[in-house]
């Protein structure tokens, strides 16, 4: 399907003039190529009539021109002076008329209507209201006045001012008679609509004396304002529907063929399936405008788009609306990334966000979608370094890899932290995405022990085992804080022969803190990369404790039985002074050593990466 | 719609010590960041401290040790201690705050008017 999109359908009156917009993929190439508008003939073959290369056709010669907006991705044609006979089928393309990269449009050019003389014409879109002015004499200023509609050749009385209201327009229609002096009447029609359209005529008095005025109602459609934007990417619908209709429920609709219109959401709590996780209907204004915004877009949005306000939260006859006709375009410059990412209870997910590249500097931000209500998404870490409360230590938003993708790293998965979660910068709204994280049956494959109780002053050595897949991988521990988290520096010694043959189930990378400070406290991660490209990670928090007044003893991890002076911590860890040990029943590879002297030529934090039987009871 | 108002400006000797103060007002629920961000003309805004709703505060590498960023108990007032002012530290300073809006997925972004730094030397 072409790229291009434009109006399906113009239509105009004799006389007048049309602005016709297209829209483009806005890429170099297509930036700079020929942009044309061309009349469909019979043989099926489309002439030119205006190009972006200065070409205007003899029929257009001084009504006409094309305009392109290369940094907009749009062109328009302006066409003036319309006549019936430029009632036809064109198109708006790029390059050569017969590549089909372009967009059939419609132009229909009626003849305007016959009005008897001195008519006043009032243009009016659906929903809206209108005030009919109405003057008269003053010898009619005591006499009845009264609003007819002209249907064919005889005239419907509408309103008079004996109370008499015609039952198409009850509770939507007032005849207003000012006080002495002023020589006119107002009838006020609210909430127009379709059937309204039509001849007037306003009446005061009657016999040969009566005072008449034409007045011509056009009720229009409101033309749907064209929208384009890039598949996986995001769309704001802005209402404004006018403070009359504020305290009435607002909804957005998208029609279907059956020309009826599907609720997409609405303020009474309804929403669409298919737009879970990936619509928000914003609170509205003081002046009680509104917005719908909608992420992760799909060839399947396209479609044309109405908001409104009913008190049934649905389109009904007669209330405001406002129209989009929304193209998806799937030349889109925004990467694909999984919309979709699993993890296991325990264990964690990397998320890749994709933000326009040219924007590296915005900030960046990771929200988690609620469906309550018109929807909201909370806040829950940004790169500026602020993570909310009940994430801390489990959740980290790092610039890498960059150019034009951050990554959000979330682990301790449980099943809460399951649904649909945004990704958003404050720079450009339409690269906002969504992702949904589910939380699948299994084991984390990083293991690591509970929570750790350090010694000050000792040596603290943190095991976290990885399987044989990730041999390949780089292994690396770091420690958490707001803005990220810090890799600590590696002893990794290389790969032995086993581990490039990887023939043990399990391998080990291990921590050391060399001696342990006050400032040790805190969470630490294990985890794996390739690159920039960040895998797993498991979490451990390490607590600082004084030394107690015995001196460390080596329990070894085989030991199953509490040793006296063990205190349980949660779920199967145990600890010995500064010693984690995992409950063997639960763990049985687990080796933490905690040496009580300093370690010779050791630096401070380091990680080592050896497989598990070469991991002796010291640290190397 | 959210206020900020500063004060505290004015002129201080080289090495001498001011202190600003910002405070919000209007309908404000919860405010996600407060900083001081300064401008030197012909410059773009730059950062000198933050604190976060979580009281974690952070410091440009020139403000570190010299300027200290404290907050009221309701959390909408902010107060930058400048000491050992130097005169590379004479600009407009503005006081900015975000606020997270759950509704709309955005953060709003509000500034002060500003107010002058002048460190004679």
């Known amino acids: 399907k072409s790229p291009v999109f434009g109006p399906q359908e113009v239509s105009s009156v004799e006389g007048n003039s049309v602005s016709i917009k297209c829209y483009y993929p806005p890429t170099s190439v297509n930036r700079h190529t020929r942009k044309y508008w061309c009349r469909k003939g019979a043989s099926g073959r489309c002439i030119t009539l205006v190009s972006s290369e200065g070409y205007v056709s003899s029929n257009y010669a001084g009504r006409a021109n094309l305009t392109n907006f290369p940094e907009n991705g749009t062109f328009v044609v302006n066409i003036a002076q319309l006549s019936r006979d430029d009632s036809g089928h064109y198109k708006c393309g790029l390059g050569i008329n017969s590549r089909g990269l372009s967009f059939d449009v419609s132009l229909e050019v009626s003849q305007g209507p016959e009005l008897p003389n001195g008519t006043e014409v009032y243009t009016v879109d659906v929903g809206r209201t209108v005030t009919i002015k109405c003057p008269f004499k003053t010898e009619n200023a005591p006499k009845t006045k009264a609003l007819y509609k002209k249907i064919g050749q005889t005239s419907v009385l509408v309103i008079d001012s004996r109370n008499y209201v015609n039952p198409n327009y009850k509770d939507r229609i007032r005849l207003r008679i000012p006080g002495t002096g002023q020589l006119i009447f107002t009838v006020v029609i609210d909430r127009l609509r379709l059937s309204d359209h039509g001849l007037y005529l306003c009446q005061a008095g009657d016999g040969s004396n009566r005072d008449e005025k034409n007045a011509d109602l056009q009720v229009l459609e409101p033309e749907p304002e064209l929208v384009y934007e890039d598949l996986r990417g995001s769309v704001t619908f802005h209402c404004a529907l006018g403070l009359e209709v504020a305290n009435v429920a607002k909804f957005l609709c998208r029609v279907n063929s059956r020309e009826t219109c599907d609720v997409v959401i609405n303020t009474l709590g309804k929403r669409d399936s298919a737009f879970e996780g990936r619509i928000l209907l914003n609170p509205q204004d003081k002046d009680g405008s509104f917005s719908v915004v909608i992420t992760g877009l799909r060839k399947e949005d396209e479609g044309r788009y109405l908001c409104g306000a009913h008190s049934d939260g649905q389109l009904q006859e007669g209330w405001p609306i406002q129209a989009w006709q929304l193209f998806v375009n799937e030349e889109s410059t925004i990467p694909r990334s999984p919309t979709v990412v699993k993890g296991v209870a325990g264990g964690s997910v990397a998320v890749l966000c994709p933000y326009n590249p040219k924007e590296s500097q915005s900030l960046k931000y990771w929200c988690l979608w609620e469906g309550a209500q018109n929807g909201r998404c909370p806040l829950l870490v940004e790169s500026q370094g602020l993570v909310q409360e009940q994430y801390e230590g489990r959740l980290s938003l790092l610039q890498e890899p960059g150019n034009g993708t951050f990554t959000v790293i979330l682990n301790q998965l449980t099943t809460q932290d399951a649904g649909f979660y945004w990704c958003l910068t404050n720079g450009d709204t339409r690269w906002r995405t969504t992702v949904e994280i589910k939380i699948i049956e299994g084991e984390p494959n990083l293991k690591v022990p509970g929570n750790v109780t350090a010694v000050l002053g000792e040596t603290l050595n943190i095991p976290c085992h990885f399987p044989c897949k990730f041999s390949s991988y780089e292994k690396y521990w770091c420690k958490w804080s707001n803005t990220g988290c810090q890799t600590l520096p590696s002893q990794d010694e290389g790969p032995s022969e086993a581990f490039v043959n990887c023939d043990e189930n399990s391998r080990l990378v291990s921590l050391t803190l060399n001696p342990v400070t006050r400032a040790d406290e805190g969470w630490y991660w294990c985890g794996v990369k390739q690159g920039h490209f960040y895998g797993e990670t498991a979490a451990v928090y390490v607590a600082v404790e004084e030394k107690k007044v015995a001196g460390s003893r080596y329990v070894s991890p085989a030991k199953a039985d509490a040793a006296p002076d063990e205190k349980v911590l949660d779920s199967g860890v145990r600890e010995i002074e500064n010693k984690a040990i995992q409950d063997p029943r639960l763990f049985a590879e687990e080796k933490v050593v905690a040496d009580t002297g300093d370690q010779a030529g050791g630096s401070r934090a380091s990680v080592d990466s050896s497989s598990s039987e070469e991991q002796g009871g010291s640290s190397k | 719609e959210v206020q900020l108002v500063e004060s505290g400006g004015g002129l201080a000797q080289a090495g001498g010590s001011l202190r600003l103060s910002c405070t919000a007002s209007?309908?404000?629920?919860?405010?996600?960041?407060m900083a001081w961000y300064r401008q030197t003309p012909g410059n773009e805004r730059e950062l000198v401290a933050r604190i976060f709703s979580n009281d974690v505060t952070h410091y440009v590498d020139s403000a570190k040790g010299r300027f200290t960023l404290s907050r009221a108990q309701d959390k909408n007032t902010v107060d930058l201690q400048m000491n050992s002012l130097e005169p590379d530290d004479a600009a407009v300073y503005y006081c900015?705050?975000?606020?997270?809006?759950?509704?709309?997925?955005?953060?709003?972004?509000?500034w002060g008017q500003g107010t002058l730094v002048t460190v004679s030397s």
């Open positions: 900015n705050a975000q606020i997270w809006s759950d509704m709309r997925g955005r953060m709003d972004t509000y």
């Open positions: 209007g309908t404000i629920s919860k405010i996600d960041v």
